[in-house]
């Protein structure tokens, strides 16, 4: 039903949902404080356009009763019932940030009336795909199905001369929420990855994965997973790996493989480490500095939710136009505005656009190098190590079938 | 990244024996491997044992079957076993970890063997 927005004369609030169930443990209190400090940046950008208005946020908690579970699980309601919680307070913002979780975003967004935007730090899956006053914050599970597609397809680079058309992809079941979208996204036999690849199984048990690593029988020598080095190590532990096996970690989320003083430990040597560029300044930044690697990226979400709202207040207001209409709403994508660490690409779908790297661990100095970098904006790739040092024979990536020639 | 102690060197006549101990601040079970390095006078320090959190072993040529290397998880200590020791054996010993991101280095311990 049609909620008033608290969105108008001067006074702009945003509604922030504080749920129980997110796609990240991240204490409720970091998240804000993300929201605080991209308030106070909001603010102060609107004052320096000469904009004398108020822009605050409203924290809304479910009573954590009922939906409990603290992952994704139980999500699917909470969020219902704190949209009901803010339909009966009259107390909807101009635009609400919150649903990190594909099913209750998903919900919502079909249960609702949306005449208001959606900022979502979160929302992995290909359902949230394509919605129109839905914004994504952190990269979605279609952004990594056509770097996959892309990568595979490649067959210039020096270190890859073979097209590839299989795959493994291990998925056990106990991943991480942005994990098990991206891996479900690769599983779904209508999704653009499947679509594209010739053969392709999903291994659900460690054994599979485990007997894969040495059969000679194995239909493919590519292998996806999702998480990180620990996550690997202790699925394959010290088993031998055949030398044509590669093994693609994707593990977006995660900073550390850019810190310094990080080394690849031995097992890492058949490995691709799919990640995202971390910040100009993130690594060091005083918003950061209590946040662990693989929530930064979280926080972060929220915080740049907080300067899109704020992107987008001042373009309206500037021109004059209203806060409460379609407009508004659809309005959340198709740009480019200036994020906590630089500018942050929105695509028609208000997807954001990142640009994906990928790591190989250099036999010589066990450190991890960049291979290649992929802008999702323009879905194409850019070779950065032209002579890596591979453990694979003749620092190449061998072909995906073993005994194929090339093609 | 993780703080690891020695103890346990000193002086030793050949074909004694001696245990050498590390301790490290943090549950060795969420390390990748532990490692036993040695450095002698004017030489390259060198790997003389490993242990991975997986179990696995492995020992320099130099030492087989004289050495071994163990764990206590309940301690978080690694032990090295040194057993028919010879001059050779000479060096300080370092013990080393890796976190599954990060190298740690103990300070070392002196192990003198001489009659």
């Known amino acids: 039903s049609q909620v008033s927005q608290n969105c108008h004369n001067g006074s702009y609030e945003i509604s922030v949902l504080m749920m129980g169930n997110s796609a990240f443990a991240e204490p409720l209190k970091n998240l804000e404080d993300a929201v605080n400090e991209g308030l106070e940046i909001v603010r102060g950008r609107l004052q320096n356009a000469g904009l004398n208005v108020t822009v605050n946020a409203t924290f809304m908690y479910s009573d954590g009763l009922i939906h409990n579970s603290g992952d994704c699980r139980s999500s699917t309601c909470e969020g219902l019932d704190l949209l009901r919680k803010i339909s009966n307070a009259q107390r909807m913002g101009c635009v609400l940030i919150g649903p990190s979780c594909t099913y209750s975003t998903f919900q919502m967004y079909l249960d609702t009336e949306l005449s208001y935007p959606m900022i979502s730090a979160g929302s992995f899956g290909l359902s949230c795909d394509y919605k129109e006053t839905l914004t994504r914050l952190m990269s979605p599970a279609r952004k990594l199905m056509y770097f996959l597609v892309n990568f595979w397809k490649t067959n210039d680079l020096p270190f890859k001369t073979y097209s590839w058309s299989t795959s493994y992809v291990y998925k056990n079941g106990t991943e991480t929420e942005d994990c098990f979208w991206y891996l479900n996204a690769l599983e779904a036999s209508v999704s653009y990855f499947s679509h594209e690849l010739g053969f392709k199984v999903v291994l659900r048990q460690d054994k599979e994965f485990q007997d894969i690593l040495m059969d000679h029988n194995r239909k493919s020598n590519v292998i996806i997973m999702c998480g990180g080095p620990e996550f690997l190590y202790k699925l394959k532990g010290d088993r031998a790996v055949a030398e044509d096996i590669v093994i693609i970690l994707v593990d977006l989320f995660n900073d550390q493989y850019f810190e310094d003083n990080v080394t690849a430990p031995d097992y890492m040597k058949n490995v691709l480490v799919l990640t995202l560029s971390p910040g100009n300044s993130l690594l060091n930044s005083s918003f950061s500095r209590n946040l662990s690697p693989t929530k930064r990226d979280f926080a972060l979400a929220y915080l740049n939710g907080i300067l899109l709202f704020g992107h987008m207040l001042k373009i309206f207001l500037e021109n004059g136009e209203n806060i409460t209409t379609p407009k508004f709403a659809h309005a959340f994508r198709n740009l480019t505005f200036e994020g906590y660490d630089g500018p942050v690409t929105l695509d028609d779908w208000g997807d954001v656009d990142s640009t994906m790297v990928l790591l190989y661990t250099s036999v010589d100095t066990k450190k991890y190098k960049v291979l290649l970098t992929y802008d999702t904006h323009v879905n194409k790739t850019y070779p950065v190590d032209m002579s890596p040092t591979f453990t694979w024979k003749n620092s190449k990536l061998p072909n995906d079938i073993t005994g194929r020639g090339p093609q | 990244q993780v703080q690891l102690v020695e103890s346990g060197g000193g002086w030793v006549h050949p074909g004694g024996s001696l245990r050498l101990s590390c301790a490290a601040s943090?549950?060795?079970?969420?390390?990748?491997?532990v490692d036993w390095y040695r450095q002698a006078p004017g030489k390259q320090r060198e790997l003389v044992a490993g242990?991975?959190?997986?179990?696995?072993?492995s020992y320099a040529d130099a030492v087989k079957g004289r050495f071994t290397i163990s764990t206590d998880n309940v301690k978080d200590t690694v032990y090295l076993q040194m057993n028919s020791v010879t001059p050779e054996d000479t060096a300080v010993y370092y013990c080393?970890?890796?976190?599954?991101?990060?190298?740690?280095w103990g300070q070392g311990t002196q192990v003198t063997v001489s009659s």
């Open positions: 080393h970890a890796h976190d599954h991101w990060r190298d740690s």
């Open positions: 943090r549950n060795i079970f969420s390390m990748y491997r």
């Open positions: 242990i991975t959190s997986g179990g696995t072993t």
